[in-house]
Interface confidence: low
C-alpha cells in the first residue's frame, strides 16, 4: 500500500559542476524497517520486468555492502526516518531526476527529486525594497539557492566595486523545506548613493570569485542645493547691493518649487533661483537660504549670514544691580546695536567722562556712596561713533553715617533731672526710619530720634543710640556724667578689731560707696553734738562715758547723706560698788535685813561674793544678801565683790547695827 510511504525533502536542488549537493530528506514506512535502498539517476519503469531501469548511483543491500564506485554518493539516512543524501563532487551530467527506490519487507516505493547542476556557479539574486529614501535604513538581501556542508561559500557586498563597511548577516538553510544561503545588509543610503551600483559577489572559501549579481540604487532624496553670494564674504554697508544664487546639484525626483528664506521665514515674491537685494538696510542683516522642493520634501541650502554694517546706535546702560549696597560689587553694561561690534567705549558718570574706562563693561568691586548717580556711555566702531543714550541711575544704599548721641541738657546733669538726648547722623540711604537706644530702659521717645529720661538715676552712666534704615549704625556711647550726693554712707570701726574695752584706742571710719563730684566733707555727731570733720573719729583711751549712738555725714556740692546711727559699746570691769541696806543700817534683832551689792559694769556683773568684817567670804553669791531673822551677832562691817568678763571690783565697808528688842532688854 503505497500510501503508507511519506517523504519530505526540497523539490529541486541546485548546484554547479565540481560543487556538491546535500539532500535533506525524511520518510516514514509504516509497515516496518527499510530493507533495501537504491538511488537511480533518471529512473524509468520497465513494464516487462516490473522493475526500474537507469543508472544506479548508490545501492545498499541486506548485507550492507556498498560497491567502491559509490563513494561519491553517500546515503546518510537510516532504516526508518532519515533518507538524507550527499553527492560530492556533483557533475553536470548529474542533472535530472534522482530516484530513491525504497523497499521494506512488504512494500516498495520510488521517490523522485529534481537536481539542477549548471556548468558554472550560478549568480545570487539581490532583493531590494520597493522604494529607497535617503537616511532611511533599508535591508538589502542577497539570496543563493545553494548550500552544502562539503563546499563552503561566502557572499560579499560591494558598492561601486568597493567592499561595503556595514556588517552583513549571513544565514544558511539545509532543511527538508528549503536549501539556500542568504546575506542581509542593513544600510542607510545617502542622496549621494543615488545611481550607484551595488554588487553581491559569490566567492568560494578562499575568496575566489564565482559569480555575482548587481543592481543600481534609486535613492529618492530632497533637492541638494548650493548657494553663492556676491560679495563672497556677505559683508556690506548700508546702501550696497547683494546677489544670491541657488544651484541644484541633485534632486530625485525632479524639483517642483523654489523659495527664499531669511532667519527661517519665507520671503514673499521670491520664487526664482536668484535673489537680488538692492540698497540694503541694517534690518536686512540675517541668515539667508534657498529652499527647493520635490515629492520627497523641501531641501535647504546652507545659510549665508548677510552682515549689513552700520555705526553704533544710541546706547543704553544696564546696571547689575541697582540699588546697590555700599561695599558690594556693581557691573555696568553698555548696550549699543552696531556692526561691526564696537571697539571702543566712553563712559560718563553724572555727565563727566570716566577716565580709563574703554570696555563694554565697567566693574566696580566695592561701591561707595559717591558712586551713586547717572551712568551713560558712547559706543564707537570703524563706521563711526554712536550717540549717548539717556543713561541709568545707580542708587547706592548704605547704613546711616557719622551717627552721634547728643545730650541736649545744660551740664552738669544731676540725679533726678530730666535728660533729653538726640540721635544725629550725617547721611543715610534709604532714609532713617527708626532709632534704637542702649541700654534699654522704660524711657520716653517723644519724637523720632529723641530720648527723654525722666528722673535720671545716679547710675545712668552711658547711653548709645543707633540710627536705622535697612541697617543700624551705632554711635559711640556718650557719658551722662550724672552728679549725685554721696551714696551708701556708713560707720565702720577700724580698731580695735575685737570688742572695745575701756582704755582702748578706738578709730571709727566714715565710709561711702561713691560720690560725684568726688570732693566731699565729713561730719561726726553724737546725740546731736558735732564731734569732728575728718573721715576718721579717734579715741586715744576710750571710757565708758564715750559709749553711745554715733552718726557720720558726707556732703558734696550736690547734697549730703547721713549714715545710720552706729552704737559704740565700751566694756569695763565692775566699778562704783557699794553695799546698801534695807530697811536701814540699824535693825532690831528678830527682824529682816537685806544687803544689796550695787555696781556699774559692762557687761553686767555675772558673779557676786560677800565678805564680813574679818574679810571672811560668806556662802552667798547673789546680788542681795538676806538676813532673817537678824541677830545681834550679825552686827558688823560688810563689803561685796562683783565679777564680769572684763574683771572684778570691790565695795567699801558698810556697817550693820543690830540692837536688842524690848523683850530681850526686859528679860535682862
Amino acid at each position: 500500500d503505497s500510501s503508507k510511504w511519506v517523504f519530505e525533502h526540497p523539490e529541486t536542488l541546485y548546484a554547479w559542476e565540481g560543487a556538491c549537493v546535500w539532500i535533506p530528506c525524511t520518510y516514514r514506512a509504516l509497515d516496518g524497517d527499510l530493507e533495501s535502498f537504491i538511488l537511480f539517476h533518471n529512473p524509468e519503469y520497465n513494464k516487462n520486468t516490473s522493475k526500474f531501469d537507469g543508472t544506479r548511483l548508490y545501492e545498499s543491500t541486506k548485507d550492507g555492502k556498498v560497491p567502491s564506485e559509490q563513494k561519491r554518493v553517500q546515503f546518510l539516512g537510516d532504516k526508518n526516518k532519515n533518507c538524507t543524501l550527499s553527492i560530492h563532487p556533483v557533475h553536470l551530467n548529474d542533472s535530472g531526476q534522482l530516484g530513491l527506490r525504497m523497499e521494506s519487507k512488504t512494500e516498495k516505493w520510488m521517490e523522485r527529486i529534481h537536481l539542477n547542476v549548471s556548468e558554472r556557479p550560478f549568480p545570487p539574486h539581490i532583493q531590494l525594497p520597493p522604494e529607497i529614501q535617503e537616511s532611511q535604513e533599508v535591508t538589502l538581501t542577497c539570496l543563493l539557492n545553494f548550500s552544502c556542508y562539503g563546499y563552503p561559500i561566502q557572499l560579499q557586498w560591494l558598492l561601486e566595486g568597493v567592499p561595503m563597511r556595514q556588517a552583513a548577516v549571513t544565514s544558511t538553510s539545509l532543511t527538508i523545506k528549503s536549501v539556500f544561503t542568504r546575506s542581509e545588509l542593513k544600510f542607510s543610503p545617502q542622496w549621494s548613493h543615488h545611481g550607484k551600483i551595488v554588487t553581491c559577489q559569490l566567492q568560494d572559501a578562499d575568496g575566489k570569485f564565482l559569480s555575482n549579481d548587481t543592481v543600481q540604487l534609486n535613492v529618492k532624496h530632497t533637492p541638494k542645493l548650493e548657494i553663492k553670494v556676491t560679495p563672497s564674504d556677505a559683508i556690506v554697508r548700508e546702501g550696497d547691493s547683494v546677489t544670491m544664487t541657488c544651484e541644484v546639484s541633485s534632486s530625485n525626483p525632479e524639483y517642483t518649487t523654489v523659495s527664499w528664506l531669511k532667519d527661517g521665514t519665507s520671503l514673499k515674491k521670491q520664487n526664482t533661483f536668484t535673489l537680488n537685494l538692492r540698497e540694503v538696510t541694517k534690518d536686512q542683516s540675517g541668515k539667508y537660504c534657498c529652499q527647493v522642493s520635490n515629492d520627497v520634501g523641501p531641501g535647504r541650502s546652507e545659510e549665508v549670514f548677510l552682515q549689513v554694517q552700520y555705526a553704533p546706535e544710541p546706547s543704553t546702560v544696564q546696571i547689575l544691580h541697582s540699588p546697590a549696597v555700599e561695599g558690594s560689587q556693581v557691573e555696568f553694561l553698555c548696550m549699543s546695536l552696531a556692526n561691526p561690534l564696537p571697539t571702543n567705549y566712553t563712559w560718563y558718570h553724572n555727565g563727566k567722562e570716566m577716565q580709563g574706562r574703554t570696555e563694554e563693561k565697567v566693574h566696580i568691586p566695592k561701591i561707595l556712596p559717591w558712586h551713586a548717580g547717572t551712568y551713560s556711555c558712547v559706543a564707537e566702531n570703524i563706521l563711526g561713533t554712536g550717540q549717548r543714550g539717556p543713561g541709568a541711575e545707580l542708587d547706592v544704599q548704605y547704613p546711616p553715617k557719622k551717627v552721634t548721641t547728643v545730650i541736649q541738657n545744660p551740664m552738669p546733669i544731676r540725679e533726678g533731672d530730666t535728660v533729653t538726648l538726640s540721635c544725629n547722623y550725617n547721611s543715610s540711604n534709604p532714609s532713617v526710619t527708626r532709632y534704637e537706644w542702649k541700654p534699654h530702659g522704660a524711657w520716653e521717645e517723644p519724637s523720632l530720634g529723641v530720648l527723654k529720661i525722666q528722673n535720671v538715676g545716679w547710675d545712668n552712666t552711658t547711653i548709645a543710640c543707633a540710627a536705622c534704615n535697612s541697617w543700624c549704625s551705632w554711635a559711640s556711647p556718650v557719658a551722662l556724667n550724672v552728679q549725685y550726693a554721696p551714696r551708701d554712707v556708713r560707720v565702720r570701726k577700724i580698731k580695735p578689731l575685737s570688742e572695745i574695752h575701756s582704755g582702748n584706742s578706738v578709730s571709727l571710719q566714715c565710709d561711702f560707696s561713691s560720690s560725684h563730684p568726688k570732693e566731699v566733707q565729713f561730719f561726726w555727731e553724737k546725740n546731736g553734738r558735732l564731734l569732728g570733720k575728718e573721715s576718721q573719729l579717734n579715741f586715744d583711751s576710750i571710757s565708758p562715758e564715750d559709749a553711745g549712738s554715733y552718726s557720720c555725714w558726707v556732703n558734696n556740692s550736690i547734697g549730703q547723706t547721713a549714715s545710720k546711727a552706729w552704737t559704740l559699746e565700751v566694756l569695763y570691769a565692775p566699778r562704783r560698788l557699794r553695799v546698801s541696806m534695807s530697811p536701814g543700817d540699824q535693825v532690831m534683832e528678830g527682824k529682816s535685813a537685806t544687803l544689796t551689792c550695787e555696781s556699774d559694769a559692762n557687761p553686767p556683773v555675772s558673779h557676786y561674793t560677800w565678805f564680813d568684817w574679818n574679810n571672811q567670804s560668806l556662802p552667798y553669791h547673789s546680788q542681795k544678801l538676806r538676813l532673817e531673822p537678824v541677830k545681834v551677832q550679825h552686827s558688823g562691817a560688810y563689803w561685796c565683790q562683783g565679777t564680769n568678763s572684763v574683771g572684778k571690783g570691790r565695795s567699801p565697808l558698810s556697817t550693820l547695827t543690830v540692837y536688842y528688842s524690848p523683850e530681850t532688854i526686859g528679860r535682862r
Partner: nanobody, 125 residues
C-alpha cells in the same frame, strides 16, 4: 585684639543634645549682634541662627527651627547655641560670628565683622 572662641563641640549620637558656647573678648559685646553658622565638608558655609544685641530677637534656618535655640549673656560676653534632637546631617564645623549692625542681613556671612575658629560637631547614626 578681637577674639571669638567657640567650645562645647564633640561627638554625639543621633537624637542627642549639645550646647556650644562662644566667648568674645576685645569688643563691646553688648553692642554686637551674634550669629552661628556651620560648614560641612565640601559644602558652603550656611546660616544656622542669629540674635540681636538685646537678646530679644532671634532668627533660625528652616532646617533647625524647633530644635536649636540661640541665646546670649551680655554680662559674661557669651553667646550660646543649644542643639537638641541632633541628626547626622547636622554634622559640621560650627562657627560663631559678631556683627555691628543689629538689624540687617543676619543670614549673610559677608555682613559679619568677626569670626571664631569653629568647633567640630559630629552626630553619629
Amino acid at each position: 585684639e578681637v577674639q571669638l572662641v567657640e567650645s562645647g563641640g564633640g561627638l554625639v549620637q543621633g537624637g542627642g543634645s549639645l550646647r556650644v558656647s562662644c566667648v568674645a573678648s576685645g569688643l563691646s559685646f553688648s553692642l554686637y549682634g551674634m550669629g552661628w553658622f556651620r560648614q560641612a565638608p565640601g559644602k558652603e558655609r550656611e546660616f544656622v541662627a542669629a540674635i540681636n544685641w538685646r537678646g530679644d530677637s532671634t532668627s533660625y534656618a528652616d532646617s533647625v527651627k524647633g530644635r536649636f535655640t540661640i541665646s546670649r549673656e551680655n554680662a559674661k560676653n557669651t553667646a550660646y547655641l543649644q542643639m537638641n534632637s541632633l541628626k547626622p546631617e547636622d554634622t559640621a564645623v560650627y562657627y560663631c560670628a559678631a556683627r555691628k549692625y543689629s538689624a540687617a542681613n543676619v543670614f549673610k556671612p559677608n555682613d559679619y565683622d568677626y569670626w571664631g575658629q569653629g568647633t567640630q560637631v559630629t552626630v553619629s547614626s
